[in-house]
């Protein structure tokens, strides 16, 4: 799976979209999880309604919401009041049994609020994040991770 980068501004909302084949994943609940380390587990943040037919209903866990357009085949995650600690690698997942298929790998980048004059030193960006050749604007800026980019900050 390629990684898609979604960028949002600190303090604002970020919408992440994950398209999928609606027939291939028919009847399956979806989830949004956060990758813990490069080879670590993906920790569940929020999942769609327990009843698949009600997947269109928005479910919240803290400041993160999930909703699923099961006919159109688009899973949408909203990160409200984006904070620097929200930056990192995530996955959209399709659940079957107790297993999960990855629909999309997502790198969330948090940009400093240009109107906020406080020190932005605690905002983390993976290397080369200034490169926007492939960016396209949806509800957020998103692009595919470029070759050589690291989805995790280097560990010392």
């Amino acid at each position: 799976h390629n990684t898609t980068v979604f960028q949002g501004v600190a303090g604002q909302s970020l919408q992440v979209s994950c398209p999928y084949d609606s027939m291939k994943h028919w009847g399956r609940r979806k989830a949004w999880c956060r990758q813990l380390g490069e080879k670590g587990p993906c920790q569940r943040v929020v999942s769609t309604h327990n009843l698949w037919l009600l997947s269109f209903l928005r479910r919240w866990n803290g400041s993160t919401a999930i909703t699923d357009d099961t006919l159109g085949g688009t899973l949408t995650i909203t990160l409200r009041n984006l904070q620097p600690h929200d930056a990192g690698l995530y996955q959209c997942q399709s659940l079957h049994g107790s297993e999960a298929d990855t629909l999309r790998k997502v790198l969330v980048e948090v940009l400093a609020d240009p109107l906020d004059h406080r020190d932005a030193g605690d905002l983390w960006f993976p290397g080369e994040s200034e490169s926007f050749e492939d960016a396209h604007v949806e509800h957020s800026i998103s692009r595919s991770l470029l070759e050589g980019e690291i989805p995790f900050p280097p560990t010392s």
Partner: antibody
Framework: EVQLVQSGAEVKKPGESLKISCKGS????????IAWVRQMPGKGLEWMGI????????RYSPSFQGQVTISADKSISTAYLQWSSLKASDTAMYFC????????????????WGQGTLVTVSS | DIQMTQSPSSVSASVGDRVTITCRAS??????LAWYQQKPGKAPKLLIY???SLQLGVPSRFSGSGSGTDFTLTISSLQPEDFATYFC?????????FGQGTKLEIK
């Protein structure tokens, strides 16, 4: 009417190759996963693997990974199971089965089965 | 892999009897379990899915229960056409393993 029709019985020698088929009708073939299941003579059922004909996404059981190849051609609504070099121990009945996901369950079950293809490998 | 163990491996019963077959998973599988019936020379037939949901067209004398690791298939009043082999299968993880089967014979 949903139907899965499998190819006929085969008698082969060890080392030979073989490809058996499973043709679906009465439903949108490309939109349902297809599983392959082995049943050796007088024995139980063994799950071999599964394929989504829509994009040929395949999952194998570790026991069968590298031993067989599962493929599909959605344009002719057919799934395949093939061997490059048969062994006597491959002698068995092979079933294909359509996988159905039930909207309140989020897992899949084999709701329609083919009639089976008997493969006999003997020198 | 998840191991599925059925008991008994065979059972003799008469028409009209109530029969219970059990299936135990080597680890918790929630309610992701199916029961199949197979007659000699035929393909298996789905009876129960999601541990307790009756497949369309299957007689109501068949019922399933259980969750986690222990499951049962019950036939409330045996009919002549019910004499067959029954398999459980977990739908929790790949590979989707089956129990070894329970042969239901006429007493």
């Amino acid at each position: 009417e949903v139907q899965l029709v499998q190819s006929g019985a085969e008698v082969k020698k060890p080392g030979e190759s073989l490809k058996i088929s499973c043709k679906g009708s009465g439903y949108s073939f490309g939109s349902y996963w297809i599983a392959w299941v082995r049943q050796m003579p007088g024995k139980g059922l063994e799950w071999m693997g599964i394929i989504y004909p829509g994009d040929s996404d395949v999952r194998y059981s570790p026991s069968f990974q590298g031993q067989v190849t599962i493929s599909a051609d959605k344009s002719i609504s057919t799934a395949y199971l093939q061997w490059s070099s048969l062994k006597a121990s491959d002698t068995a009945m092979y079933f294909c089965a359509r996988q159905r996901t039930f909207y309140y369950d989020s897992s899949d079950y084999s709701d329609y089965w083919g009639q089976g293809t008997l493969v006999t490998v003997s020198s | 892999d998840i191991q599925m163990t059925q008991s008994p491996s065979s059972v003799s019963a008469s028409v009209g009897d109530r029969v219970t077959i059990t299936c135990r998973a080597s680890q918790g599988i929630s309610s992701w379990l199916a029961w199949y019936q197979q007659k000699p020379g035929k393909a298996p037939k789905l009876l129960i899915y999601a541990a307790s949901s009756l497949q369309l067209g299957v007689p109501s004398r068949f019922s399933g229960s259980g969750s986690g690791t222990d499951f049962t298939l019950t036939i409330s009043s045996l009919q002549p056409e019910d004499f067959a082999t029954y398999f459980c299968q977990q739908a929790d993880r790949f590979p989707r393993t089956f129990g070894q089967g329970t042969k239901l014979e006429i007493k």
